[in-house]
Interface confidence: low
């Protein structure tokens, strides 16, 4: 078990949204996590979440295989060998057409408070 306190994630940003994919960026202290666990859940359905793990050195990933014009909740956790951070979530609506790309809302995490930033 770790002796020190593992810091939480900083912020998560949906950087790009397409009709069937999106790009997720996040911040985290360097070297704090072995990997990140990402769940992509279609909102308002009982469909199983899509799960993805990415190495702890990454701060960005593409999330393919989504449906167009659909609300998703994306949750990310930083994971060490014996610790998982508080989950950080962002909601996003995928684009309705192939060329409909926009920058989505940005959500920051500050000690249990969500701050919403619209661009």
């Amino acid at each position: 078990a770790s002796t020190g306190e593992t810091p939480n994630l900083g912020e998560v940003v949906v950087a790009e949204v397409g009709w069937d994919a999106l790009k997720l960026n996040w911040t985290a202290p360097e070297g704090a996590y072995e990997y990140f666990f990402i769940q992509v859940q279609e909102a308002d359905t009982v469909e199983a979440a899509q799960n993805l793990t990415v190495p702890g050195g990454l701060r960005s990933t593409d999330l393919p295989g989504l449906k167009a014009a659909t609300h998703y909740t994306i949750t990310i956790r930083g994971v060490t060998q014996d610790f998982s951070t508080t989950p950080l979530s962002v909601e996003v609506l995928t684009a309705s057409g192939l060329n409909d790309i926009f920058e989505a809302q940005k959500i920051e995490w500050h000690e249990g408070t969500h701050h919403h930033h619209h661009h």
Epitope: Y35, F37, Q39, A49, N51, T53, V79, T80, Q81
Partner: antibody, heavy 121, light 107 residues
Framework: QVQLVQSGAEVKKPGSSVKVSCKAS????????ISWVRQAPGQGLEWMGG????????NYAQKFQGRVTITADKSTSTAYMELSSLRSEDTAVYYC??????????????WGQGTTVTVSS | DIQMTQSPSSLSASVGDRVTITCRAS??????LGWYQQKPGKAPKRLIY???SLQSGVPSRFSGGGSGTEFTLTISSLQPEDFATYYC?????????FGQGTKVEIK
Amino acid sequence: QVQLVQSGAEVKKPGSSVKVSCKASGGTFSSYAISWVRQAPGQGLEWMGGIIPIFGTANYAQKFQGRVTITADKSTSTAYMELSSLRSEDTAVYYCARLYGYAYYGAFDYWGQGTTVTVSS
Amino acid sequence: DIQMTQSPSSLSASVGDRVTITCRASQGIRNDLGWYQQKPGKAPKRLIYAASSLQSGVPSRFSGGGSGTEFTLTISSLQPEDFATYYCLQNGLQPATFGQGTKVEIK
């Protein structure tokens, strides 16, 4: 010291299912991924899938998708692998392995003793 | 899936020999590669992780190298207990894939 203890050998009929257990002791169970790896007689090692008990969600190799179910019971620190629609080519030693590193498909640093599953009519 | 091509598939060597086994990945996997030793009827045992880091308790005669697509496991001076089958494992991209194994036999 981490130990993974698997259930005993099984003999199954083609078309049936088998469920193998893997009980972990030592270390934290929930946050470590447990993978299942199989080895057919005289063959190499093959990753089947894995689970991180804290999340309860499993990940499977394409080859086994739809036929394998991996679960974990945090209360007993036990992971399970169930393989259905068994055929003769599923005859193998099945290992559970605890991972170090990147979740489901990290480098395996602790292994169970293996469970021999024989599929024969 | 990433293909891991391991060579040679078998080799004969004598105690004291220097032995090198190679693993080639079909695409770049950074340094996300481990090496395992397996003896008949036993579970595999990890020797090397992250391409070149020695697993705790493993003798220093074992060493790993490489990154990207080309990796090596070297046994600097083969000992009687080293006769076994060795596997590489890539864990950079899912699904994890093993090389087909290299059997090290006594000459």
